[in-house]
């Protein structure tokens, strides 16, 4: 076990701050909630602190809880491939380039690590070239999440770990919004981390509201679990 | 359902006593710092006082101290306000709100994500 994972033994309290300009439309998130790890679960609120959200809630569910993918469950064969945890407390940045098919982009840096025993993801994001109708901004996309497989390989040269994936949200006229992700994640702290060999995160999200809210929210329940690298041989004949 | 649920309001003598309860479902209580809060008709909503998380600290607005009492039960995911003495003046809705923020952030109703619905405490 590295010194990070036994960090995420129990539910721990995350707390998620993002501020956002997209074409020039400011805003502010602030989300709470807990993880954990033994089971790949999220529990999350997210309530947008300066009116209402500029952007579509599910454009942003990779950059608010794909962000804190410490809390995936690596199963016992795997967690020697636990990038995620290994960099904790201390944490990592997390930057990512999203491309939305005929559209724009965001560019997001995240700081991911401990402030106490509370788990913050603080991040920043900067959207631009949206067209103003287009399916972000113009709010065409349903309030729903498929699930996907986020694919992470070991980047060697920077000590930590490259991360590709391509998001479908739905749209309302029953069409697809492809959104690629490149994603790149750098140990804070100088302490070791694991890299990993290739592998991928299986991720499940449920997005809801809560009735008795009158804030711009979202509601995100998520599960995370990693796979894609069979048991040793040596497992095999036990 | 990600929610708090406030119960035990009602009618209560000048100085008698009520016990309100703030239930979580979808959330596990003892990760939060859990706040109350009170709003009477035409005023301001107060801070009544908070129970913070991984164990017992509680803290008090001035109004409250020595009368009422913060408490929790984990296994029933639920945390209590005691109101014991109770005055005219405690006459309000009460409400809970759970938080992993610490310090002046959390004797702040608008910094709170999660919030209930409130009970109402008729003196």
């Known amino acids: 076990m590295s010194k990070g994972e036994e960090l995420f033994t129990g539910v721990v309290p995350i707390l998620v701050e993002l501020d956002g300009d997209v074409n020039g439309h400011k805003f502010s998130v602030s989300g709470e909630g807990e993880g954990d790890a033994t089971y790949g679960k999220l529990t999350l609120k997210f309530i947008c602190t300066t009116g209402k959200l500029p952007v579509p809630w599910p454009t942003l569910v990779t950059t608010f809880s794909y962000g804190v993918q410490c809390f995936s469950r690596y199963p016992d064969h795997m967690k020697q491939h636990d990038f995620f945890k290994s960099a904790m407390p201390e944490g990592y940045v997390q930057e990512r380039t999203i491309f939305f098919k005929d559209d724009g982009n965001y560019k997001t840096r995240a700081e991911v690590k401990f402030e106490g025993d509370t788990l913050v993801n603080r991040i920043e994001l900067k959207g631009i070239d949206f067209k103003e109708d287009g399916n972000i901004l113009g709010h065409k996309l349903e309030y729903n999440y498929n699930s996907h497989n986020v694919y992470i390989m070991a980047d060697k040269q920077k000590n930590g770990i490259k991360v590709n994936f391509k998001i479908r949200h739905n749209i309302e006229d029953g069409s697809v919004q492809l959104a690629d992700h490149y994603q790149q994640n750098t140990p804070i702290g100088d302490g070791p981390v694991l890299l990993p060999d290739n592998h991928y995160l299986s991720t499940q999200s449920a997005l809801s509201k809560d009735p008795n809210e009158k804030r711009d929210h979202m509601v995100l329940l998520e599960f995370v679990t990693a796979a894609g690298i069979t048991h040793g041989m040596d497992e095999l004949y036990k | 359902d990600v929610q708090l649920v406030e119960s035990g309001g009602g009618l209560v003598q000048a100085g008698g006593s009520l016990r309100l309860s703030c239930t979580a479902s979808?959330?596990?209580?003892?990760?939060?710092?859990i706040g109350w809060f009170r709003q009477a008709p035409g005023k301001e909503r107060e801070f009544v006082g908070i129970i913070i998380r991984n164990g017992d600290t509680t803290y008090y607005a001035d109004s409250v101290k020595g009368r009422f009492t913060i408490s929790r039960d984990n296994a029933k995911n639920t945390v209590y306000l005691q109101m014991n003495s109770v005055k005219p003046a405690d006459a309000a809705v009460y409400s809970c709100?759970?938080?992993?923020?610490?310090?002046?952030?959390?004797?702040?109703?608008?910094?709170?994500?999660?919030r209930g619905q409130g009970t109402q405490v008729t003196v």
């Open positions: 979808g959330l596990t209580i003892s990760t939060y710092n």
């Open positions: 709100g759970a938080t992993v923020r610490a310090g002046a952030a959390a004797e702040q109703y608008n910094s709170y994500i999660f």
